[in-house]
């Protein structure tokens, strides 16, 4: 039982939450709260929006983003892409891990209609020590932040 | 290997399923089947809709609800809120953990159109012994139950 | 620590990815890439679209499918069903485990409008040795495959 408890206490896990500073508008990944509220890091590090692996292995990574808007810009059902991406020293470009595309504002049948949608991603990926995972949303202007419960990003070793 | 198997057998986990009695209409949380069919409890308790932690630690908690209806009431794209909430004796009001807002019936462009949508939530949260997690849906009248496979609620320690 | 690492290295886990060959049109389950790219099998087997348990226990199983299309066939908001199903020698028919129904193309208000939607399922189920889990989508013609990041299927023991 001591062994089992120790195993859980050491198992890498993290849950990061959305904050007003999450959306940078700079074309970079979303940034996250790592310590206060519901957020925590256990055996994983954080750097500029990225969860960083301290231990090699398979991780279940997940992210949810809350989307919302009023009507459809230019009457178009714009496509929103929400994805989890890996950064690794061996490759200069980020690698797509898990991605979703949605056309949520097509739900609003007039330009003044408020709409909400949510996108959830989760899956198991392998991370080496030092490899990073980030969340990107295109177009991030449609991400609706409030209090850390609607948009978030996490992982745990499996 | 014996150690490893024992560890898994003792790891708290649960999966609860929707049933006709899930929707109470009382303003309370959804209620769940805990034993029949796909439902089970292992190292977690259940009380009035809530999963109750018997062991302190970080848990991946999740819920899915199946939504559906015919047309949009009053032609409005009503917002549905699906959330996981924590109850703890010190704080009588539930604490939001993971929440989604959706406007699914905006998908139906006429009042006679049948629509379906699904909302999934999952994330890692900390629970102390005796703390409870419940699921709420507003408006719960749009939750469509059938056989325990479309709406459910679960957790496991990570 | 050795014990803890061994436990993780042996813990059954898998992540399978969508490929051009995933959609058979034969009425069978989706097929998956098991080795290339992001796909892997660790302590689970694969057979004709199915993840096969080598070790009895509770597994968190998950699947995401990327849906997309142009307009709504016949102007109808067609219902898409995405589900995880269990095959077991004891029963001739597949058992529903986790299922979602969605009406995504209702988002497009004209017949020429492109729409995208995503469906995610995840939950804990019990598998005996030799039992299989498959993914089905009806109508699978609306599944949009690309590079293994948008439609996938996985599991790990909890």
């Amino acid at each position: 039982l001591i062994q089992e408890r120790r195993s859980h206490q050491n198992n890498p896990a993290a849950h990061l939450t959305g904050a007003n500073s999450s959306l940078t508008g700079s074309g970079g990944p979303l940034l996250w709260e790592t310590q206060l509220g519901l957020a925590f890091l256990r055996g994983l590090d954080y750097h500029d929006g990225a969860l960083v692996a301290n231990k090699a292995g398979y991780y279940y990574i997940y992210s949810k983003v809350q989307l919302g808007g009023v009507g459809c810009p230019l009457g178009l059902a714009s496509t929103i892409t929400h994805g989890l991406y890996k950064r690794t020293p061996r490759y200069p470009e980020e690698l797509e891990l898990l991605v979703s595309q949605q056309s949520p504002c097509g739900r609003a049948t007039s330009n003044s209609r408020v709409w909400w949608d949510s996108s959830f991603l989760g899956g198991v990926v392998h991370l080496e020590v030092g490899e990073e995972v980030v969340v990107r949303v295109l177009d991030e202007r449609l991400v609706r932040l409030r209090d850390g419960t609607r948009s978030y990003f996490g992982a745990f070793m499996v | 290997l014996i150690q490893e198997r024992r560890s898994h057998q003792n790891n708290p986990a649960a999966h609860l399923t929707g049933a006709n009695s899930s929707l109470t209409g009382s303003g309370g949380p959804l209620l769940w089947e805990t034993q029949l069919g796909l439902a089970f409890l292992r190292g977690l308790d259940y009380h009035d809709g809530a999963l109750v932690a018997n062991k302190a630690g970080y848990y991946y908690i999740y819920s899915k609800v199946q939504l559906g209806g015919v047309g949009c009431p009053l032609g409005l794209a009503s917002t549905i809120t699906h959330g996981l909430y924590k109850r703890t004796p010190r704080y009588p009001e539930e604490l939001e953990l993971l929440v989604s807002q959706q406007s699914p019936c905006g998908r139906a462009t006429s009042n006679s159109r049948v629509w379906w949508d699904s909302s999934f939530l999952g994330g890692v949260v900390h629970l102390e012994v005796g703390e409870e997690v419940v699921v709420r849906v507003l408006d719960e009248r749009l939750v469509r139950l059938r056989d325990g496979t479309r709406s459910y609620f679960g957790a496991f320690m990570v | 620590l050795i014990q803890e690492r061994r436990s993780h290295q042996n813990n059954p886990a898998a992540h399978l990815t969508g490929a051009n060959s995933s959609l058979t049109g034969s009425g069978g389950p989706l097929l998956w890439e098991t080795q290339l790219g992001l796909a892997f099998l660790r302590g689970l087997d694969y057979h004709d679209g199915a993840l096969v348990a080598n070790k009895a226990g509770y597994y968190y199983i998950y699947s995401k499918v990327q849906l997309g299309g142009v307009g709504c066939p016949l102007g109808l908001a067609s219902t898409i069903t995405h589900g995880l199903y269990k095959r077991t020698p004891r029963y001739p028919e597949e058992l529903e485990l986790l299922v979602s129904q969605q009406s995504p193309c209702g988002r497009a208000t004209s017949n020429s409008r492109v729409w995208w939607d995503s469906s995610f399922l995840g939950g804990v189920v019990h598998l005996e040795v030799g039992e299989e889990v498959v993914v089905r989508v009806l109508d699978e013609r609306l599944v949009r495959l690309r590079d293994g990041t948008r439609s996938y299927f996985g599991a790990f023991m909890v």
Partner: antibody, heavy 117, light 110 residues
Framework: QVQLVQSGAEVKKPGASVKVSCRAS????????MHWVRQAPGQRLEWMGW????????KYSQKFQGRVTITRDTSASTAYMELSGLRSEDTAVYYC??????????WGQGTLVTVSS | QSALTQPASVSGSPGQSITISCTGT?????????VSWYQQHPGKAPKLMIY???KRPSGVSNRFSGSKSGNTASLTISGLQAEDEADYYC??????????FGGGTKLTVL
């Protein structure tokens, strides 16, 4: 129940250091941040910093940066706040407080530190 | 991080209602529903009275209520009693793992 018990009052000379302890009970010590807040006589509450008890990460108020060090001993469920280079204006009651979500609850009973030559 | 702005003092007679304001910015009070209020009697540790803008912990009288509008949060105490005389502090999450206290308000029950 959840409780924080702090060490007793201290009298220090200017230039010295003081280390105040805060022993936690009734909850999982490693799963919450611990904050330190001080209050000089007749003055307002002043946030000094926090420690993530689980991983040891710290964040300090700019005002105290370089003079304050917050540590913890997980085996003893105890957090510590050490303030160096003491001056007379550091005379205050020092409180530890558990971070629960986005508020402080509970608080320790306080430790009076008097800096006097 | 500059302190949230509170009035230095407020007063009221027993049975009356009083309101204490707490003004911040869109980066703290206005940006999140994460305002809490603490009561501190002389020589005692602060006590949580309100969390998440308007919620009361168990054991706190329902005479205490909280609200928020824009960048200003408010604590209202109805049916003032002698034992309510104390200092009151607001507190807010301010993003990026930072927090900020108010300057404190001394409540006098006349």
């Amino acid at each position: 129940q959840v409780q924080l018990v702090q060490s007793g009052a201290e009298v220090k000379k200017p230039g010295a250091s003081v280390k105040v302890s805060c022993r936690a009970s009734g909850y999982t010590f490693t799963s919450y941040l611990m904050h330190w807040v001080r209050q000089a006589p007749g003055q307002r509450l002043e946030w000094m910093g926090w420690i993530n008890v689980g991983n040891g990460n710290t964040k300090y108020s700019q005002k105290f940066q370089g003079r304050v060090t917050i540590t913890r001993d997980t085996s003893a469920s105890t957090a510590y706040m050490e303030l160096s280079g003491l001056r007379s204006e550091d005379t205050a009651v020092y409180y530890c407080a558990r971070n629960y979500y986005n508020w402080f609850d509970p608080w320790g009973q306080g430790t009076l530190v008097t800096v006097s030559s | 991080q500059s302190a949230l702005t509170q009035p230095a003092s407020v007063s009221g007679s027993p049975g009356q209602s009083i309101t204490i304001s707490c003004t911040g910015t869109s980066s703290d009070v206005g940006g999140y529903n994460y305002v809490s209020w603490y009561q501190q009697h002389p020589g005692k540790a602060p006590k949580l009275m309100i969390y998440d803008v308007s919620k009361r912990p168990s054991g706190v009288s329902n005479r205490f209520s909280g609200s928020k509008s824009g960048n200003t949060a408010s604590l209202t105490i109805s049916g003032l009693q002698a034992e309510d005389e104390a200092d009151y502090y607001c507190f807010s999450y301010a993003g990026s793992s930072t927090v900020v206290f108010g300057g404190g308000t001394k409540l006098t029950v006349l």
